[in-house]
């Protein structure tokens, strides 16, 4: 049993059919030595007397908030949450696999530059009673600090039968250096509590990893005289680390026809214009992705070519 | 370079972005396996970081780059007497056409164009970790080139900061 | 795109040789090793060995060695593999094939095969 | 030379069925394994890399895990189209070298 904070504990059971369970000894936070019943959440019914409570956790009936009383008045309370642990794996039933860069990724974070913000996101398919937290810093042996918002729900989606909610938190490096080389990875734990069952998740990343830019903006189309070419130009988005001189990005450049089976010719190039072909219904993409380091491409930009 | 003069900003900016495209060929995969995992935080704490007070941000250039440039050459430096080393000649067999011979050869070239014959700047002890499993070979290799990845990166924006803002 | 085309079927004596060509187009010819493996009918899969064309140095797999030479003509983009003193346990499929950018062994890319018969 | 020694030689297994092939190394090959599926009459087709490292286009139900000398393919929920013959292959010491190869019946 640890505490997760004043006045909630979280229990930790091996989970398997016939566990014994862990015991627990409550004590009321008084100076009163007699007296003292035990309840369990709002059943009156007397759990036990005495300064100290014992207990056997064994299933989530056993969980909740114990509540020592003298005299009819509430003394203090002990909320004990489960922490379920099968086949020596802990529990991850409240969070949704995400299954993307690869298996067990509950969550996910990116950064749209340098300047050490991130967000980070994860899915639930539990509406009520549940509660996040969040905690990160840079490195886990000698921390260095990164301060986080509230958690927000910041989608809802309907899956076939199921709403999924989307949950996501905003972070920054208290002390960023962007043109440093990274070399402790940034470390993000949430603690989730659904009812009375309590789990965590971890994320370790280096930003450099989870940079994905904002597409490139102002995308202009200018057509060359007598010809069925085009100027195309583009700009670095706003969000982009700067200067542009030192944070470099590179552009993949497209023109799309009406069909999306219609073959694709994708350009790569550093600069921030080009002259394409660009046909009456076709239309002109450009996506961006860091000059030197093969983190995320942007999303696609796209104009008309009318 | 040494004793302050300007290196050759714009030869220097095209090695550096070979350099980036190599490490990337070499080692493409992102999070194929997470390396960290595996032996954690102390594992490259002794190769080389351009670190904050080395004074390759942009401002730190233009102030002096010769700082920057110093640690970038012996980042440099190390990295190339890795490559050559039989982490990555042993087993796993990598063939001749490997991006790793490249690479080794693009980190002496560009050490080289920092540092002209006749400058000595000293250079840190090289580490000798020699595994003998092709298991921990190839882990210690994912974890070099991924270092490397991330160390060449920074490199090649300084010095494409440096060709487009201190070329004379 | 990557693609490697090998000559067609050969039907030879015993005794004799059998040169079979394969023709890569989509990547730079002098940049990538070009690997041979043999299927024997109804067989696995043999390694036997691969050409640079960068500097024309072929490595060979020991078992074949003495049996095989392999060679590159970087003006056509063409890799050759010639078996001598055929037998007819040399009566197989033989494949050309490169590897991954990354520079290990293992085959993205195969040419369509060319089947050698060796019979009297 | 290292040999590779694959299990089985053939199986028959049902649509919807989890099948897995093993293979192992005479010695520590890391993760240098590939693996490749040849269906009747046609060219070998990768299928993994590094143990487990899906190579593109191919799909999930085909996964790969294994280090060392013991190595395993597995294929999630068998499809008609499986059918084919399945190799591993070693590519961490010259001369590389194959399995012998598992045939993969559809009952």
């Known amino acids: 049993i640890w505490e997760l904070k004043k006045d909630v504990y979280v229990v930790e059971l091996d989970w398997y059919p016939d566990a014994p369970g862990e015991m627990v000894v409550l004590t009321c936070d008084t100076p009163e030595e007699d007296g003292i019943t035990w309840t369990l959440d709002q059943s009156g019914e007397v759990l036990g007397s005495g300064k100290t409570l014992t207990i056997q956790v064994k299933e989530f009936g056993d969980a909740g908030q114990y509540t020592c009383h003298k005299g009819g008045e509430a003394l203090s309370h002990s909320l004990l949450l489960l922490h379920k642990k099968e086949d020596g794996i802990w529990s991850t039933d409240v969070l949704k696999d995400q299954k993307e860069p690869k298996n067990k990724t509950f969550l996910r974070c990116e950064a749209k530059n340098y300047s050490g913000r991130f967000t980070c996101w994860w899915l639930t398919t539990i509406s009520t009673d549940l509660t996040f937290s969040v905690k990160s810093s840079r490195g886990s042996s000698n921390p260095q600090g990164v301060t986080c918002g509230a958690v927000t729900l910041s989608a809802e989606r309907v899956r076939g039968d199921n709403k999924e909610y989307e949950y996501s938190v905003e972070c920054q490096e208290d002390s960023a250096c962007p043109a440093a080389e990274e070399r402790l990875p940034i470390e993000v734990m949430v603690d989730a509590i659904h009812k009375l069952k309590y789990e965590n998740y971890t994320s370790s990343f280096f930003i450099r990893d989870i940079i994905k830019p904002d597409p490139p903006k102002n995308l202009q189309l200018k057509p060359l005289k007598n010809s069925r070419q085009v100027e195309v130009s583009w700009e670095y988005p706003d969000t982009w680390s700067t200067p542009h001189s030192y944070f470099s990005l590179t552009f993949c450049i497209q023109v799309q026809g009406k069909s999306k089976r219609e073959k694709k010719d994708r350009i790569f190039t550093d600069k921030t214009s080009a002259t394409v072909i660009c046909r009456k219904n076709a239309s002109f993409s450009v996506q961006a992705q860091d000059r030197y380091y093969s983190s995320s491409w942007s999303e696609w930009a796209s104009v008309p070519c009318s | 370079v040494p004793g302050g003069s300007s290196p050759a900003w714009a030869q220097c900016q095209q090695l550096s972005q070979k350099l980036c495209t190599l490490a990337w060929s070499a080692h493409p995969l992102v999070g194929h396996m997470d390396l960290r995992e595996e032996g954690d935080e102390e594992t490259t704490n002794d190769v080389p970081h351009i670190q904050c007070g080395d004074g390759c941000d942009p401002q730190g250039l233009r102030d002096n780059s010769q700082f920057c440039l110093q640690r970038i050459r012996q980042g440099l430096i190390f990295y190339e007497k890795l490559l050559g080393s039989d982490i990555f000649t042993g087993e796993p067999s990598l063939l001749p056409d490997s991006p790793v011979g490249q690479l080794h050869a693009s980190l002496l070239g560009l050490s080289q164009l920092l540092q002209p014959e006749g400058h000595h700047w000293e250079t840190q002890q090289i580490p000798s970790p020699s595994p003998s499993q092709p298991w921990q070979r190839l882990l210690l290799r994912f974890k070099i080139l991924r270092s490397l990845q991330a160390f060449v990166a920074v490199a090649a924006r300084v010095f494409a900061h440096g060709a487009a803002t201190l070329s004379p | 795109q990557v693609q490697l085309v090998q000559s067609g079927a050969e039907v030879k004596k015993p005794g004799s040789s059998v040169k079979v060509s394969c023709k890569a187009s989509?990547?730079?010819?002098?940049?990538?090793?070009i690997h041979w493996v043999r299927q024997a009918p109804g067989q696995g899969l043999e390694w036997m060995g691969y050409?640079?064309?960068?500097?024309?140095?072929?490595k060979y797999n020991e078992n074949f060695k003495g049996k095989v030479t392999l060679t590159a003509d970087k003006s056509t983009s063409t890799a050759y593999m010639e078996l001598s003193s055929l037998r007819s346990e040399d009566t197989a499929v033989y494949y050309c094939?490169?590897?991954?950018?990354?520079?290990?062994?293992?085959?993205?890319?195969w040419g369509q095969g060319t089947l050698v018969t060796v019979s009297s | 030379d290292i040999q590779m020694t694959q299990s089985p030689s053939s199986l028959s297994a049902s649509v919807g069925d989890r099948v897995t092939i093993t293979c192992k190394a005479s010695?520590?090959?890391?993760?240098?394994v590939a693996w490749y599926q040849q269906k009747p009459g046609k060219v070998p087709k990768l299928l993994l890399f590094?143990?487990?490292t899906r190579h593109t286009g191919v799909p999930d139900r085909f996964s790969g895990s294994g280090s060392g000398t013991d190595f395993t393919l597995t294929i999630s929920s068998l499809q008609p189209e499986d059918l084919a013959d399945y190799y591993c292959?070693?590519?961490?010491?010259?001369?590389?070298?194959f399995g012998q190869g598992t045939k993969l019946e559809i009952k």
């Open positions: 094939a490169i590897p991954d950018r990354s520079g290990y062994a293992w085959f993205i890319y």
């Open positions: 989509g990547f730079t010819f002098t940049d990538q090793t």
């Open positions: 050409i640079y064309p960068r500097d024309d140095s072929p």
């Open positions: 010695r520590d090959v890391a993760i240098a």
């Open positions: 590094w143990a487990s």
């Open positions: 292959h070693q590519y961490s010491s010259y001369p590389f070298t």
